[in-house]
């Protein structure tokens, strides 16, 4: 159930409507809960979460990552630069979230919910951003070939890729959450 649609909210019509910032905060935390459920299945199914071979697979993935220059960390914090990085990063993660769609047995719906909730989050953030011109959208053709390449990997690499996407997406969202709370 997406944030704002659970029974508690329905039962409390007198509650103040959420501000834009609160809605974004709640949306990110909802996605993080979904990621946690997916990571739980991944970690129970394989020993990827304990693996020291992550670096090998990580070299083949170009997962979005926060860096000091992006303005989202406490040192060198820059609201506008950071917001652009968050939106750009989420757009770049979309192809990886698409890859995750057929990777789960018992958490198939959860994987879909994470993907759809991320699309909603991007829309929320685009409304908040002043400098939309600075946001680069990934090329669909490049994404399509990346998806084909990821799906053609052997089983071990696919499991490792799934683990790395979830871990990186969690980390990216948590960095985003901390930064957005400063805005």
């Amino acid at each position: 159930v997406p944030p704002g649609e659970d029974s508690k909210d329905v039962a409390a019509p007198h509650r103040q409507p959420l501000t834009s910032s609160e809605r974004i905060d709640k949306q990110i935390r909802y996605i993080l809960d979904g990621i946690s459920a997916l990571r739980k299945e991944t970690c129970n199914k394989s020993n990827m979460c304990e693996s020291s071979k992550e670096a090998l697979a990580e070299n083949n993935l170009n997962l979005p990552k926060m860096a000091e220059k992006d303005g989202c960390f406490q040192s060198g914090f820059n609201e506008e630069t950071c917001l652009v990085k968050i939106i750009t990063g989420l757009l770049e993660f979309e192809v990886y979230l698409e890859y995750l769609q057929n990777r789960f047995e018992s958490s198939e719906e959860q994987a879909r919910a994470v993907q759809m909730s991320t699309k909603v989050l991007i829309q929320f953030l685009q409304k908040k951003a002043k400098n939309l011109d600075a946001i680069t959208t990934p090329d669909p053709t490049t994404n399509a070939s990346l998806l084909t390449k990821l799906q053609a990997q052997n089983q071990w690499l696919q499991d490792m890729t799934t683990h790395l996407i979830l871990r990186s997406f969690k980390e990216f969202l948590q960095s985003s959450l901390r930064a957005l709370r400063q805005m």
Epitope: E22, Q74, E171, Q174
Partner: antibody, heavy 123, light 107 residues
Framework: QVQLVESGGGLVQPGGSLRLSCAAS????????MTWVRQAPGKGLEWVSS????????AYADSVKGRFTISRDNAKNTLYLQMNSLKSEDTAVYYC????????????????WGQGTQVTVSS | DVVMTQSPSSLPTSLGDSVTITCQAS??????LSWYQQKPGQTPKLLIY???KLQTGVPSRFSGSGSGTSFTLTISGLEAEDLATYYC?????????FGQGTKVELK
């Protein structure tokens, strides 16, 4: 079982430096946020600094910003706190703590604490 | 910065009493609040996280409530082993901050 063991504390003169270490065992260190918390003699707890898992993102209390540097070595399962330009008000027991989470929980909270290492800044 | 105001600073009480400690945040911190217990000469211990979630192994007489700016830690039926100092911590935005502490002692 989870263990956090701090070392590196001691007596130092004002303006001096110290490097605290925290050796972690019993859990997958790289998956967890880690934090330093301190407690001055007879006083309350003070959050000092946090370092996040893989992003390299760090945060500091205003009282230590620019003087202290938190870092981690995931290969060695060790957390560090480099303390420069020490002042008498930095005198405290320094605790290394693990943030709740890893794979599941995302909410802040420190579920494991080391025994602490005493730092005394005095001339 | 989010400032945490914890009250009271000292709470004289009797065994068996119900004890309530409050923490007020200067701005909304959602449910990013945890509570800790510290006994003299010991390291702090996590009791509650996420404002109301009981940490594994903590007795059920401890409970937390609140969201936004106002939070409460309740001990229902104080036991001798609960005599300690209690701290809240906001983990919502930098810099994170502890409350000043509440010392629960016998009258």
């Amino acid at each position: 079982q989870v263990q956090l063991v701090e070392s590196g504390g001691g007596l130092v003169q004002p303006g001096g430096s110290l490097r605290l270490s925290c050796a972690a065992s019993g859990f997958t260190f790289s998956n967890y946020y880690m934090t330093w918390v301190r407690q001055a003699p007879g006083k309350g707890l003070e959050w000092v600094s946090s370092i996040y898992s893989f992003s390299g993102d760090t945060a500091y209390a205003d009282s230590v910003k620019g003087r202290f540097t938190i870092s981690r070595d995931n290969a060695k399962n060790t957390l560090y706190l480099q303390m420069n330009s020490l002042k008498s008000e930095d005198t405290a027991v320094y605790y290394c703590t693990r943030n709740l989470g890893g794979v599941v929980v995302t909410t802040n909270g420190y579920d494991y604490w080391g025994q602490g290492t005493q730092v005394t800044v005095s001339s | 910065d989010v400032v945490m105001t914890q009250s009271p600073s000292s709470l004289p009480t009797s065994l068996g009493d119900s004890v309530t400690i409050t923490c007020q945040a200067s701005q909304s911190i959602s449910d990013e609040l945890s509570w800790y217990q510290q006994k003299p000469g010991q390291t702090p211990k996590l009791l509650i996280y996420g404002a109301s979630k009981l940490q594994t192994g903590v007795p059920s007489r401890f409970s937390g409530s609140g969201s936004g700016t106002s939070f409460t830690l309740t001990i229902s039926g104080l036991e001798a082993e609960d005599l300690a100092t209690y701290y809240c911590l906001q983990g919502y935005s930098w810099p994170f901050m502890f409350g000043q502490g509440t010392k629960v002692e016998l009258k």
